[in-house]
Amino acid sequence: QSVCAGTENKLSSLSDLEQQYRALRKYYENCEVVMGNLEITSIEHNRDLSFLRSVREVTGYVLVALNQFRYLPLENLRIIRGTKLYEDRYALAIFLNYRKDGNFGLQELGLKNLTEILNGGVYVDQNKFLCYADTIHWQDIVRNPWPSNLTLVSTNGSSGCGRCHKSCTGRCWGPTENHCQTLTRTVCAEQCDGRCYGPYVSDCCHRECAGGCSGPKDTDCFACMNFNDSGACVTQCPQTFVYNPTTFQLEHNFNAKYTYGAFCVKKCPHNFVVDSSSCVRACPSSKMEVEENGIKMCKPCTDICPKACDGIGTGSLMSAQTVDSSNIDKFINCTKINGNLIFLVTGIHGDPYNAIEAIDPEKLNVFRTVREITGFLNIQSWPPNMTDFSVFSNLVTIGGRVLYSGLSLLILKQQGITSLQFQSLKEISAGNIYITDNSNLCYYHTINWTTLFSTINQRIVIRDNRKAENCTAEGMVCNHLCSSDGCWGPGPDQCLSCRRFSRGRICIESCNLYDGEFREFENGSICVECDPQCEKMEDGLLTCHGPGPDNCTKCSHFKDGPNCVEKCPDGLQGANSFIFKYADPDRECHPCHPNCTQGCNGPTSHDCIYYPWTGHSTLPQHARTP
């Protein structure tokens, strides 16, 4: 199917009507599926719109407004999905289609195959010359039982309208027998839960059909309610992971497909990325784009998503000399600084000659997200009330690709600083270190700086800071939980490494094996929280003995094979079918009888759960991904 992007211009149009028509044609010529909204506005009366005959499906809304043409040739439009609605209400909006000072305007809707609006209402009004729209049984087309005020269709705009052909039983899109409205819902047997192709019980369409069908199978649908998988309408596309009943785990499905609009595709179009089995134009803000095996995918960011920003003297900050109040907001949510960070007096204290105010010290917290500086870090000024550089607590790497007089780290004459607090700093890839004349700075002498270096020709000048013996005398020493590797400042979170155990960044005496709110296991010298599916045991007993839901002493909810799970598999996609299980009195999961296709309460075919005329449209996944 040829797919095109829709628009979201509402009623705004190009001032040049010729261009407006050309743009419409360019968008929709040879387009079968409009991924978005189909907006037809400000088109003159003599324009050839026959190219619209190719459109069969619109995922958003259809807007036809402020036009002068006589006939709307959307003859093959079968379904409007209404994933976006006009004015948040209408899937189909047709209004003001006439010329105020003349005889031109919309007379006939050529929507003779429109049999399904999945979401949203219909608004047809103020079309001076329009005929037949008021004969249409819109309730047959609109899927949801929308409030009546959301299906507003005014009576004939013109007194000169003809009647429907007698074979149409009073419902038609135009005057001939070819213009009769095809009813596919209100004429069905009451046992049909959806559409039908005749009045009998045997004439029900498959529940996955939308807009009608030519037969009872999922391959006989005119359109799909959810997804079209190689011609068959399905509730969901073949999932990325399928449940393996032997291993009790979700495993990679090599037959997986991605949802692209209402289609299941083996591969997303080249300008799309995969997000949770869907093809999307861009990753959401909480995810980042990565490439795996040649496929661009959206992966959840562990905390904040990577964002590269220009540093001082680079790109948009090429002419800047220092971080200051006029540019500090450019560093919001940055994780990587391409270039340098420089803090000078005129930045920190302001520059009245250039009308730059002093930095609000609180704003320096923007640097808490920075993990990498590709150039150098130069601190020659800092707010007097800030005693450390903890705003750089997440800085891991200083690249030194650009150096300042051979330096990649420079901290000079900061009398207010008592500790550096670069607690994540692991590497200074190139360049020298120069930390001098910081008369109150302690802890610097506990660190073996050369362990941060990547090359043998890197050097250090750390001089004329607070004397080590003075620091010790005043108790400005590493926390007792730190190892002999030293620390960046006071407290158990500033250690380069731990004497005993660590929980995240913090050094601790011991893990919460047998007590504490959150129970843990020991992975070497690291304390790791037990899986959330493990039941917290009473004090003195281990809650788990390793990672994952298969290492619990006892399950919090249910047990599926060796794994503790939130609930037993209930419609998980297996290799060839959906997997349903029930829980026994011991809360262990067991497979339902093969005849149970919608779940069960026990092991026999008599225990099947039967949901009349409904499908599992969203299938929860409660199994372990390896």
């Epitope: 000078l344 250039n354 000024s381 420079l410 250090i460």
Partner: antibody, heavy 119, light 110 residues
């Protein structure tokens, strides 16, 4: 006592090179900066470049880039300044001066070396 | 043409006070410490003031200095004939990564 002692006066022809030395004593040579500052007859002071011996790499003023080379020999506590492609405008007194590091004032100066460039 | 400017000359009678100005930009004086040097005829310069307003040991308190924004000043009170010399201000320039000096001011004690 901190001291900087420079080599003697030089007379050079245009196009030639000159190498002036500056021997330091009385302090930890490697972690303090040595800069070269020149003064043409009747003119002001002009910074040419500098080096902190422990770092090894020198920093040069753009004007002299490519023509000047500053090196340090830590075994003899001596810093050298070599200026190539000499022209008559390079006639000046060349001073070495110590600073505690980058961005610091020049607290000790050598006695100066007069370099005359004349054909 | 120096990036830091000083008046070419100033003069005053013995015992009087004289002020020498030094004007630069945010990249040098504005963002860095200013130092002042005295150069007596035929000798090397000598450090007079560092870190905007501090005197090295041995420099009399007749010499004082201050900095405001992108300008600095040197004050000499109780002028003596031995103060007759050239005076230079200096600072690091963060943009150019060089040390810069003012053009120098010749002080004449009348």
């Amino acid at each position: 006592e901190v001291q900087l002692v420079q080599s003697g006066a030089e007379v050079k022809k245009p196009g030639a090179s000159v190498k002036v030395s500056c021997k330091a004593s009385g302090y930890t040579f490697t972690s303090y900066g040595i800069s070269w500052v020149r003064q043409a007859p009747g003119q002001g002071l002009e910074w040419m470049g500098g080096i902190i011996p422990i770092f090894g790499t020198a920093n040069y003023a753009q004007k002299f880039q490519g023509r000047v080379t500053i090196t340090a020999d830590t075994s003899t506590s001596t810093v050298y300044m070599e200026l190539s492609s000499l022209r008559s405008e390079d006639t000046a007194v060349y001073f070495c001066a110590r600073s505690r590091g980058y961005y610091d004032p020049f607290d000790v100066w050598g006695q100066g070396t007069l370099v005359t460039v004349s054909s | 043409q120096s990036v830091v400017t000083q008046p070419p000359s100033v003069s005053a009678a013995p015992g009087q006070k004289v002020t020498i100005s030094c004007s630069g930009s945010s990249s040098n004086i504005g963002n860095n410490y200013v130092s002042w040097y005295q150069q007596l005829p035929g000798t090397a310069p000598k450090l007079l003031i560092y870190d905007n307003n501090k005197r090295p040991s041995g420099i009399p308190d007749r010499f004082s200095a201050s900095k405001s924004g992108t300008s600095a000043t040197l004050d000499i009170t109780g002028l003596q004939t031995g103060d007759e010399a050239h005076y230079y201000c200096g600072a690091w320039d963060s943009s150019l990564s060089v040390a810069v000096f003012g053009g120098g001011t010749k002080l004449t004690v009348l």
